[in-house]
Amino acid sequence: LEIKVNPPQDFEILDPGLLGYLYLQWKPPVVIEKFKGCTLEYELKYRNVDSDSWKTIITRNLIYKDGFDLNKGIEGKIRTHLSEHCTNGSEVQSPWIEASYGISDEGSLETKIQDMKCIYYNWQYLVCSWKPGKTVYSDTNYTMFFWYEGLDHALQCADYLQHDEKNVGCKLSNLDSSDYKDFFICVNGSSKLEPIRSSYTVFQLQNIVKPLPPEFLHISVENSIDIRMKWSTPGGPIPPRCYTYEIVIREDDISWESATDKNDMKLKRRANESEDLCFFVRCKVNIYCADDGIWSEWSEEECWEGYTGPDSK
């Protein structure tokens, strides 16, 4: 006799208004009497419609929450698993049931903002900037909303960057406990003459940090050939162990690059009689602290003062 189990009921994908953080929820299946005491597990698969791979979750809960790219549609499917002690060790699964979440097609794609860029400056404040859609009327203006776990609801930007009295960016400060989790952004727009397509972005703040450049550079030469370079980590909240550095050394007309995770470096001079010996350095957040980062600007150049040439007094 083949054992069968029903799929979950009322599977749906819900948008609670958190800019891409969606709820996938369902109700238990109708279970026949002999399986009433059995543990039910649910196998949930979901993805953005353009993705070639599904995310798979096994859970006993009736809801699952995750972040999605709302620029694209979402599809999910779910089935019931009966625990093996209820089925004499055989695997019993229901058929799949499916649900989808379609994106709003309000407004043409040409009205959506372009070139959205966000940088988290020195792990302290976030600046996002964008360009208006390709074909928009002159009365079009844009509004930015953001949400991350810990906020009760999505918030609107309170400090817009403007060009010709139009919002072209936003600065966010005091983002408490906002890193190491998905940060969701929606930029929507309004015009009296046409609907504007919304644009969604999701990232993690620690991966888009642009630090201040290193400071207090110092260079010295020991034994006439050993170059010793030192610098200080920039001020701010980033722990020193989170930096990686790129150094450019200039010896007369020759320049070369080096890299380190420490804030000093020793190298050999290429030529004993070089008259010009300078270096500058930049930094970014390293792999210990984030998956990615943005290089700082280059520091000021620091040169060795110790050389005394034939024209020196």
Epitope: S53, W54, K55, T56, D179, Y180, F203, Q204, Q206, N207, P239, R241, C242, T244, D261, K284, N286, I287, Y288, C289, A290, D291, D292, G293
Partner: antibody, heavy 121, light 106 residues
Framework: EVQLLESGGGLVQPGGSLRLSCAAS????????MSWVRQAPGKGLEWVSA????????YYADSVKGRFTISRDNSKNTLYLQMNSLRAEDTAVYYC??????????????WGQGTLVTVSS | DIQMTQSPSSLSASVGDRVTITCRAS??????LNWYQQKPGKAPKLLIY???SLQSGVPSRFSGSGSGTDFTLTISSLQPEDFATYYC????????FGQGTKLEIK
């Protein structure tokens, strides 16, 4: 579900070269730093190399610096390890691993099944 | 470079036992320490990160503690599936592993 599948291992002579690949699926590959970790037969784990999500930063253990090159092709969801000037002591199972991050720290949260590299004459 | 030393190298215990494995760093690594479990022929599996945070899906009988240079992994009541090799790993500077502790059935 997150999957990492290594390939490219095999037998190679000392001084030879080999390129390992790691095909990733089930997550947004370009958003994660990735790493290679190896394990010599009957021995412990040794971190080899790492690369940031965009590929812009790379890191190497001293034991492989100058001989191995890590790279990634985010359009193909694939991580690579080019191994040159191979030595007998490079013989190991090579694992591809994904970084997870917490407040100013990291760990390897997903691992592939490994591919065996044997360097012998 | 930072060295990680685990003790003991091997350990025999019985189902239901409480087991503690220690890991010592050659310099202070704050709480930047992770623990992994590896079974023969399989890839390592993350158990604990940041010295004491339990990875999602890992049974609560596993716990970690310590900071600075001395750390411990505790299994409160050994289960048959826990017999494996355990590794600590620091991520304070580069990424070094301990030599492993093999946990065997007594």
């Amino acid at each position: 579900e997150v999957q990492l599948l290594e390939s490219g291992g095999g037998l190679v002579q000392p001084g030879g070269s080999l390129r390992l690949s790691c095909a990733a699926s089930g997550f947004t590959f370009s958003s994660y730093a990735m790493s290679w970790v190896r394990q010599a037969p009957g021995k412990g784990l040794e971190w080899v190399s790492a690369i940031s999500g965009s590929g812009g930063s790379t890191y190497y253990a001293d034991s492989v610096k100058g001989r191995f090159t890590i790279s990634r092709d985010n359009s193909k969801n694939t991580l690579y390890l080019q191994m040159n000037s191979l030595r007998a002591e490079d013989t190991a199972v090579y694992y591809c691993a994904r970084y997870g991050h917490y407040a100013y720290g990291s760990y390897f949260d997903y691992w592939g099944q490994g591919t065996l590299v044997t360097v012998s004459s | 470079d930072i060295q990680m030393t685990q003790s003991p190298s091997s350990l025999s215990a019985s189902v239901g036992d409480r087991v503690t494995i220690t890991c010592r760093a050659s310099q202070s690594i704050s709480s930047y320490l992770n623990w992994y479990q590896q079974k023969p022929g399989k890839a390592p599996k993350l158990l604990i990160y940041a010295a004491s945070s339990l990875q999602s899906g890992v049974p609560s009988r596993f716990s970690g503690s310590g900071s600075g240079t001395d750390f411990t992994l505790t299994i409160s009541s050994l289960q048959p599936e826990d017999f494996a090799t355990y590794y600590c790993q620091q991520d304070y500077y580069l990424f070094t592993f301990g030599q492993g502790t093999k946990l065997e059935i007594k």
